[in-house]
């Protein structure tokens, strides 16, 4: 369990940099995370909205807080979900 946990952690941390990338090859991963964010009302992988780098400037709706019952915070003048997606992803992988 702890070994698979470590592998998942390392993989997610490594892939965090893909969110701030602007190339076509990273688009598929970004789109998958966007869908995940919308479903689980979370933002980014490790550092929240900051994980998206300059992409956040162009698409601040990426993490937009649409549910006032969930913890939200201001980031670059926008209300975004406070919780990162890493724990949700780990739970999701564990269940599936």
């Amino acid at each position: 369990k702890s070994k698979s946990d470590r592998i998942v952690n390392e993989t997610l941390y490594e892939n965090t940099k893909l969110l701030s990338a602007t190339g076509e090859s990273e688009k598929q991963f970004q789109e998958a995370i966007i869908v995940f964010q919308e479903e689980f009302k979370c933002c980014g992988l490790v550092n929240g909205a900051a994980d998206w780098g300059n992409n956040f400037q162009h698409y601040p709706e990426l993490c937009a807080c649409l549910d006032k019952q969930r913890p939200c915070q201001s980031y670059n003048g926008k209300q975004v979900y406070k919780e990162t997606c890493i724990s949700f992803i780990k739970d999701f992988l564990a269940k599936n």
């Epitope: 789109e31 966007i34 869908v35 919308e38 479903e39 689980f40 009302k41 400037q57 162009h58 698409y59 601040p60 709706e61 937009a64 807080c65 649409l66 549910d67 006032k68 939200c72 201001s74 003048g77 926008k78 209300q79």
Partner: antibody
Framework: EVQLLESGGGLVQPGGSLRLSCAAS????????MSWVRQAPGKGLEWVSA????????YYADSVKGRFTISRDNSKNTLYLQMNSLRAEDTAVYYC?????????WGQGTLVTVSS | QSVLTQPPSASGTPGQRVTISCSGS????????VYWYQQLPGTAPKLLIY???QRPSGVPDRFSGSKSGTSASLAISGLRSEDEADYYC???????????FGGGTKLTV
């Protein structure tokens, strides 16, 4: 090319029900949130409802909450709006739109008339 | 009564610059992106500006958006007759937990 085609509109009596459909093509439907926006004759735009890509989250305007239900079938690339307990003030052209932040593509709309 | 306030009408002559305002509050414009939509007579709305000031591909650079505090504005320069339409601002209101539109501005050229 992104295409959204609404259907199911028509004339219905107050208190009646109607189900609108929106057939989507030209994009990966299951990757996008979807919305319904309406426009009463000669009036402005009013957001009605939105649904997340996997249907986990739904959102409704206060004016339709408890009466309308948004749903989707990702295997059929189709968005739905079940409208119950219809009122005269629900008379409008109903547009299906991709996403909700922002609505980046719109269908041509279907007219719903609620009248006795 | 719309949550976002827009002037009901605006006008200009060909070649002129016109600005349409959109006023809101901290629960909508102040903390979220603003979007602008153009609705030509008898047609469905079309996205004109997203994320306060970004233009989707295909939208001429004559259209520009800006935001300051709880207000936003849409500027159209080099006005053309085909710009005659209704313009709506919109954003998410996290107090209402819903998307809100301005009442719309009818632009006459």
């Amino acid at each position: 090319e992104v295409q959204l085609l609404e259907s199911g509109g028509g004339l219905v009596q107050p208190g009646g029900s109607l189900r609108l459909s929106c057939a989507a093509s030209g994009f990966t439907f299951s990757s996008y949130s979807m919305s319904w926006v309406r426009q009463a004759p000669g009036k402005g735009l009013e957001w009605v409802s939105a649904i997340s890509p996997g249907s986990s989250n739904t959102y409704y305007a206060d004016s339709v909450k408890g009466r309308f239900t948004i749903s989707r079938d990702n295997s059929k690339n189709t968005l739905y709006l079940q409208m119950n307990s219809l009122r005269a003030e629900d008379t409008a052209v109903y547009y299906c739109a991709r996403k909700h932040m922002p609505f980046d593509y719109w269908g041509q709309g279907t007219l719903v008339t609620v009248s006795s | 009564q719309s949550v976002l306030t827009q002037p009901p009408s605006a006008s200009g002559t060909p070649g002129q610059r016109v600005t349409i305002s959109c006023s809101g509050s901290s629960s909508n414009i102040g903390n979220n992106s603003v979007y602008w939509y153009q609705q030509l007579p008898g047609t469905a709305p079309k996205l004109l500006i997203y994320s306060d000031s970004q233009r989707p591909s295909g939208v001429p650079d004559r259209f520009s958006g800006s935001k300051s505090g709880t207000s936003a504005s849409l500027a159209i320069s080099g006005l053309r007759s085909e710009d005659e339409a209704d313009y709506y601002c919109g954003t998410w209101d996290y107090s209402l937990n819903g998307y809100v539109f301005g009442g719309g501005t009818k632009l006459t050229v």
